[in-house]
Interface confidence: low
């Protein structure tokens, strides 16, 4: 398994609608045709998978229908958007990139983006 550098922003503030976007950029050592991008969340020393997508270079990222993530790719950059975030989802979101095909297999893991989520104040007439 060969290492690959992955860069991502240190801090991102989610919008009032609970949407956070950031760029994950990887230094591709070869001409990969198939790339897998995974977003991991690290909290309290636990790592959990948020979403993942495999894409062919030049094509769009396809996340599962029920995924909270969407994304677009451009060259060695992936623009990731995570939706539906609440204050409790604040944490470190790590971008993991795998160059799946052709061999050799490369794996790169970013240092993480701290996403801060602030729940909007409820409207005065809200029941919640």
């Amino acid at each position: 398994c060969k290492a690959m550098h992955v860069a991502q922003p240190a801090v991102v503030l989610a919008s009032s609608r609970g949407i956070a976007s950031f760029v994950c950029e990887y230094a591709s050592p070869g001409k990969a045709t198939e790339v897998r991008v995974t977003v991991l969340r690290q909290a309290d020393s636990q790592v959990t998978e948020v979403c993942a997508a495999t894409y062919m270079m030049g094509n769009e990222l396809t996340f599962l229908d029920d995924s909270i993530c969407t994304g677009t790719s451009s060259g060695n950059q992936v623009n990731l958007t995570i939706q539906g975030l609440r204050a409790m989802d604040t944490g470190l979101y790590i971008c993991k990139v795998e160059l799946m095909y052709p061999p050799p297999y490369y794996l790169g893991i970013g240092n993480g983006t701290q996403i801060y989520v602030i729940d909007p104040e409820p409207c005065p007439d809200s029941d919640f």
């Epitope: 398994c1 198939e34 790592v47 998978e49 993991k96 799946m100 061999p103 297999y105």
Partner: antibody, heavy 121, light 107 residues
Framework: EVQLVESGAEVKKPGASVKVSCKAS????????ISWVRQAPGQGLEWMGW????????NYAQKLQGRVTMTTDTSTSTAYMELRSLRSDDTAVYYC??????????????WGQGTLVTVSS | EIVMTQSPSSLSASVGDRVTITCRAS??????LAWYQQKPGKAPKLLIY???ALQSGVPSRFSGTGSGTEFTLTISSLQPEDFATYYC?????????FGGGTKLEIK
């Protein structure tokens, strides 16, 4: 050091059930799944299914569906595999294995020592 | 299910030999293949994953190649501790399936 330690050998009668345990140590238990693989005497390896230690999701081999249940106890970092309605062709060594993981694919990087289950009348 | 066929089923070789084991999938599995080594009475040990990635701690004399339906495991120079049974495993599609194994014996 990652270790998976399985429970001891079992002898069961046809129709009975067996529950094998697998205690994990040396890594964050909830960051990986536990898969179960069995090997009949002198035969090859057969994947039985896996359980996510994070959320308890399972995926079982279709041929065992309805007879197998996999569970975990995160407080003790232990996985369990129960096989019911045992038949003679269930006689095998049962292995637990680490995987899949969040940072790995559906392959198995650490294995338990194996538990021999003998089904005989 | 995807059927994994290994060849040969058994193989005799000498220390220092170069050995190649083949694994064929009944349908394309991309690079989603792992290789394991198993010694009698012991659990399998992961050697290669993603068709060509060497597992940490595994000697560099082991290498894997292939994609799609045909894969090979090569041991460049056999050592005494390499005599064992080798299995391939696909992790492209449920159910995960293993090859029937290749028993590598001393000539």
């Amino acid at each position: 050091e990652v270790q998976l330690v399985e429970s001891g050998a079992e002898v069961k009668k046809p129709g009975a059930s067996v529950k094998v345990s697998c205690k994990a140590s040396g890594y964050t238990f909830t960051s990986y799944g536990i898969s179960w693989v069995r090997q009949a005497p002198g035969q090859g390896l057969e994947w039985m299914g896996w359980i996510s230690a994070y959320n308890g999701n399972t995926n079982y081999a279709q041929k065992l569906q309805g007879r197998v249940t996999m569970t975990t106890d995160t407080s003790t970092s232990t996985a369990y595999m129960e096989l019911r309605s045992l038949r003679s062709d269930d006689t095998a060594v049962y292995y637990c294995a680490r995987g899949p993981g969040i940072l790995t694919g559906y392959y198995f990087d650490y294995w338990g020592q194996g538990t021999l289950v003998t089904v005989s009348s | 299910e995807i059927v994994m066929t290994q060849s040969p089923s058994s193989l005799s070789a000498s220390v220092g030999d170069r050995v190649t084991i083949t694994c064929r999938a009944s349908q394309g599995i991309n690079y989603h293949l792992a290789w394991y080594q198993q010694k009698p009475g012991k659990a399998p040990k992961l050697l290669i994953y993603a068709a060509s990635a060497l597992q940490s701690g595994v000697p560099s004399r082991f290498s894997g190649t292939g994609s799609g339906t045909e894969f090979t495991l090569t041991i460049s120079s056999l050592q005494p501790e390499d005599f064992a049974t080798y299995y391939c495993q696909q992790f492209n599609t449920y159910p995960l399936t293993f090859g029937g194994g290749t028993k590598l014996e001393i000539k």
